[in-house]
């Protein structure tokens, strides 16, 4: 079954970091671009970052830009998203999906920022 | 950035209702417009993706239309499970993929 | 431009080897996964191996499983298919080709192919 | 493996013709739908991609459409440069797999 897991979300306070791993499985997952979303509390869904299959290239919304890193390990199927100098504006449930169709999700993961 | 909207942002309707709701993009996307539902507490959802093509497993109830900068999601007779809230999401400007602010779709 | 070259085709007996190369120019070779595809005469397509961009991932249809090897130079800009343990059946036109470096696409551009002939 | 099956495998058609070749999967490959078009002699040329999405350069003649594991590939007005063999993809997971081809032949 084509599955993804997000991990590692949580409480953190302003400036810090956290580090989000999204396990993927039941599909070839070299083959695939990725892509982090995410939706703030009773707010609509904002797309972060996207990776290409390779790893090669990484795309970024503006609102993440210089602070979020998106990396991937094709030898492990799992995705991460490096997110450093945290704001009360990051606090999101944060859904990886698959590829250019986002055809398949996680069930979210929540990173809360507050002190 | 190509910026999406979306109407109404909720609506209340009755079982066996058919339903339209509509998306516009701020420049044109071609065809390139995917629809999501999204249940409270889950993942959106995949219903929809190149304006009009219904992804396996989905209802025929469920279809779309349009091209360039707007779009309709139609559910012709609403099911108790279609209460959800609905996105546009274009994906011509990739990788910038843009969302709507979402539809509501509640019970009346 | 975009350019794929493969070099190596020939004609070679049951059970010995041949090793084809592709030479990439006109884009960021070592970004893109690269495949080889074969097309016995007057048949359809055949996907043969897949190489991630970096080398690091290889992988075969069952039909050549265990004796062909992809592999890559990315300072060379250059792909490789050794063969080994032909047989008449390997005999086709390959192509070398371009995967999507974006998302899973399928090739986008395509060499003008290689012909293999095994044959006694 | 997923097969991939195509159908039909030829079929003659006339200039301006509308004409629409058909491709199955043997189990849900979501977009993830490729076609080619190869003439004698030639390699492949990719035309569409991820079922909808036309190739940089191809005619708008040329279109694309369905998922999961039923699509179809539907030229609007042959043109005499459009006789050729057509070939589904799927590039869903590996090993990737053809079709058998669809030769479309004058008429």
């Known amino acids: 079954e084509v599955q993804l897991l997000e991990s590692g979300g949580g409480l953190v306070q302003p400036g810090g970091s956290l580090r989000l791993s999204c396990a993927a499985s039941g599909f070839t997952f070299s083959l695939y671009s990725m892509n982090w979303v995410r939706q703030a509390p009773g707010k609509g869904l904002e797309w972060v970052s996207s990776i290409y299959s390779s790893g090669g290239s990484t795309l970024y919304a503006d609102s993440v830009k210089g602070r979020f890193t998106i990396s991937r390990d094709n030898s492990k199927n799992t995705l991460y998203l490096q997110m450093n100098s945290l704001r009360a504006e990051d606090t999101a449930v944060y859904y990886c999906a698959r590829g250019r169709a986002f055809d398949i999700w996680g069930q979210g993961t929540m990173v809360t920022v507050s002190s | 950035d190509i910026q999406m909207t979306q109407s109404p942002s909720s609506l209340s309707a009755s079982v066996g209702d058919r339903v339209t709701i509509t998306c516009r993009a701020s420049q044109s996307v071609g065809t390139y417009l995917n629809w999501y539902q999204q249940k409270p507490g889950k993942a959106p959802k995949l219903l929809i993706y190149a304006t009009s093509n219904l992804r396996s497993g989905v209802p025929s109830r469920f279809s779309g239309s349009g091209s360039g900068t707007d779009f309709t999601l139609t559910i012709s007779s609403l099911q108790p499970e279609d209460f959800a809230t609905y996105y546009c999401q274009q994906s011509y400007s990739i990788p910038r993929f843009t969302f709507g602010p979402g539809t509501k779709v509640d019970i009346k | 431009e975009v350019q794929l070259l493969e070099s190596g085709g020939g004609l070679v007996q049951p059970g010995g080897s041949l090793r084809l190369s592709c030479a990439a120019s006109g884009f960021t070779f070592s970004v893109y996964p690269m495949i080889w595809v074969r097309q016995a005469p007057g048949k359809g397509l055949e996907w043969v191996s897949y190489?991630?961009?970096?080398?690091?991932?290889?992988w075969y249809a069952d039909s050549v499983k265990g004796r062909f090897t992809i592999s890559r130079d990315n300072s060379k800009n250059t792909l490789y298919l050794q063969m080994n343990s032909l047989r008449a059946e390997d005999t086709a036109t390959y192509y070398c080709?371009?995967?999507?470096?974006?998302?899973?696409?399928?090739?986008?551009?395509w060499g003008q192919g290689t012909l293999v002939t095994v044959s006694s | 493996d997923i097969q991939m099956t195509q159908s039909p495998s030829s079929l003659s058609a006339s200039e301006g013709d509308r004409i629409t070749l058909t491709c199955r999967a043997s189990?849900?490959?979501?977009?993830?739908l490729n076609w080619y078009q190869q003439k004698p002699g030639r390699a492949p040329k990719l035309l569409m991609y991820a079922a909808t999405t036309l190739q940089s350069g191809v005619p708008s003649r040329f279109s694309g459409s369905g998922s999961g594991t039923d699509f179809t590939l539907t030229i609007s007005g042959l043109r005499p440069e459009d006789f050729a063999t057509y070939y589904c993809?799927?590039?869903?997971?590996?090993?990737?797999?053809f079709g058998g081809g669809t030769k479309v032949e004058i008429k």
């Open positions: 189990q849900s490959i979501s977009i993830y």
């Open positions: 993809q799927q590039s869903y997971d590996i090993p990737l797999t």
């Open positions: 190489i991630s961009s970096s080398g690091g991932q290889t």
């Open positions: 080709a371009r995967g999507d470096d974006y998302d899973s696409s399928g090739p986008d551009y």
